[in-house]
Amino acid sequence: VLPAKPENISCIFYYEENFTCTWSPEKEASYTWYKVKRTYSYGYKSDICSTDNSTRGNHASCSFLPPTITNPDNYTIQVEAQNADGIMKSDITYWNLDAIMKIEPPEIFSVKSVLGIKRMLQIKWIRPVLAPHSSTLKYTLRFRTINSAYWMEVNFTKEDIDRDETYNLTELQAFTEYVMTLRCAPAESMFWSGWSQEKVGTTEEEAPYGLDLWRVLKPAMVDGRRPVQLMWKKATGAPVLEKALGYNIWYFPENNTNLTETVNTTNQTHELYLGGKTYWVYVVSYNSLGESPVATLRIPALNEKTFQCIEAMQACLTQDQLVVEWQSSAPEVDTWMVEWFPDVDSEPSSFSWESVSQARNWTIQKDELKPLWCYNISVYPVLRDRVGQPYSTQAYVQEGIPSAGPVTQADSIGVKTVTITWKEIPKSKRNGFIKNYTIFYQAEDGKEFSKTVNSNILQYRLESLTRRTSYSLQVMASTNAGGTNGTKINFKTLSISHHHHHHHHHH
């Protein structure tokens, strides 16, 4: 059987290294050897590259080596396959070296911001050592912010090798780290070099981008002053690297700027003590380059009625997120402030907040919240400078069984009855929403009985007990993850009711 006709011939010129052709099929059933016939020097010269299937590796490949590779040139390539039964010739293929030249990657030697030019990085690189000196090179520059997985690309060409190999990348984010990599190819070639070593550069810092500002209104004190906890943070969209040197706050009662007070702080929170009137609060951040735009907040008067528009709210868990959704009766409200903090018996150590625009839902990654902790989540509608009534809910990102069961005691022990009371489990030990309590009780050497009651019940009267009998009892508190028993208590029913006993005594 004759060998298969060599097809899919593909050639590539590795500049100053070799000219390599490959073809299919890669493997023949019987012993086959190949000749690659080349004409070069624009058809004036010819030679042969030979291979056979005893050659190691992929034998459907052959390379011509210097010094007979000169550029520019046009080659013809024909592959002959031969076995014991005869020869099969491929079609003649034509190759322009400029069109199939592959060069090595360039080397970026500098990625720098240029003093005074904002949001730009200047990339300087070294042209590949193995690249034709006279050739115009085309380039692809890939770049991404350091925390992103997504590359952006820009294409350009460079002609003059005596000038700096430089490209100015504009319209970047301020004070942001970028990763860069570059590849190149001769302008006419279909083959790109590999990508260069990645380099990192940082755009120039600017005046701060802006602030998000919020407050917690606390109950008025005895002297009538209202503590207002102000808090602020870098606005969404601000550069990751941005750092403020400090913050200026000024505030005054509405319509009375003469009473303006100012505060300078390096913290991102500050407590003000305000009167009962409406106040306006302004905050700016600053660094060595200037100030951010002003963040403004209106603090309502003590007696001001706030609007209510959130009608319902649900919290649900997806595989890796907590999603809170709400319904509103006010279509004009499209900004909301979400607060969340752990529901603990003491003052919460962490208080978080975030603005939501043009949506009626809020999402947080589960791993940003602690499992087994209950979170209070409140959503405030914000309409221009007015803040409405919040709607609140609670959520766990992961429930567990309670760390402790209820502390239980037996009261009002009778002949056939007993009243059991138990305390709520402390918040820190619940590990989930308590959905019910189950009372397990058992007479000495008797059968165990149980009774399940709702989570809002903390007392239960057991009836139909046996007189003058010792019982053991415990209460189990259950979450969706399971239950935990409280301490076991023992009691003994009376042989005669106190009522009868006293009655008898009176006679």
Epitope: F109, I126, R127, L130, D164, Q197, E198, K199, V200
Partner: antibody, heavy 121, light 107 residues
Framework: EVQLVESGGGLVQPGRSLKLSCVAS????????MTWIRQAPGKGLEWVAS????????YYPDSVKGRFTISRDNAKSTLYLQMNSLRSEDTATYYC??????????????WGQGTLVTVSS | DIVMTQSPTSMSISVGDRVTMNCKAS??????VDWYQQKTGQSPKLLIY???NRYTGVPDRFTGSGSGTDFTFTISNMQAEDLAVYYC?????????FGGGTKLELK
């Protein structure tokens, strides 16, 4: 085999000039950027100057800018460092290095043996 | 310019020891750190580039690792001929800058 041989070092008074040379062999000189790096006695390494393969662009740190000039003669495969207005803090061994380069490896894979420049009155 | 801070500045070691030294960059340099060895009276030699590739002919007892701002160079089985000063260098951006060096001495 790549070889870099520096010469021209010696004792010179502050304010005077000196010219260092570096003859390269074993590679195609005009394909590569070249760099001078120095090392003060008992101290670390400090970049001094770089030049592109064509000689079209040069780079210097602030410490030598305006006083030192790097140049090359590709026909002679020779790199130069002209040092003017020398100061005592320029006292160092000056190394000629090939690079930075696009060839796989570090920026400075090849170094000469160094030539000592002593600036003293 | 990027500052490369090398630690420790010197170490007393014995033959056969595992030796680790560190280099901290003042800003992110990606993976663009090389390590050089300089023996007394000799010019520096490239050992490791970017930041874990062994240069041609360098024994495999020399290794490098790290990215961003923190880099480590290790000699797994110290030999007498490894007594030298070791320098890290960032090649992320011009100008290239070197660490102050770590000198290895015999105990």
């Amino acid at each position: 085999e790549v070889q870099l041989v520096e010469s021209g070092g010696g004792l010179v008074q502050p304010g005077r000039s000196l010219k260092l040379s570096c003859v390269a062999s074993g590679f195609t000189f005009n394909n590569y950027w070249m760099t001078w790096i120095r090392q003060a006695p008992g101290k670390g390494l400090e970049w001094v100057a770089s030049i592109t393969n064509t000689g079209g662009s040069t780079y210097y740190p602030d410490s030598v800018k305006g006083r030192f000039t790097i140049s090359r003669d590709n026909a002679k495969s020779t790199l130069y460092l002209q040092m003017n207005s020398l100061r005592s803090e320029d006292t160092a061994t000056y190394y000629c290095t090939r690079g930075p380069t696009t060839v796989v490896g570090g920026w400075f894979a090849y170094w000469g043996q160094g030539t000592l420049v002593t600036v003293s009155s | 310019d990027i500052v490369m801070t090398q630690s420790p500045t010197s170490m007393s070691i014995s033959v056969g020891d595992r030796v680790t030294m560190n280099c901290k960059a003042s800003q992110n340099v990606g993976s663009n750190v090389d390590w050089y060895q300089q023996k007394t009276g000799q010019s520096p030699k490239l050992l490791i580039y970017r930041p874990s590739n062994r240069y041609t002919g360098v024994p495999d007892r020399f290794t490098g690792s790290g990215s961003g701002t923190d880099f480590t160079f290790t000699i797994s089985n110290m030999q007498a001929e490894d007594l030298a000063v070791y320098y890290c260098m960032q090649s992320n951006s011009y100008p290239p800058t070197f660490g102050g060096g770590t000198k290895l001495e015999l105990k």
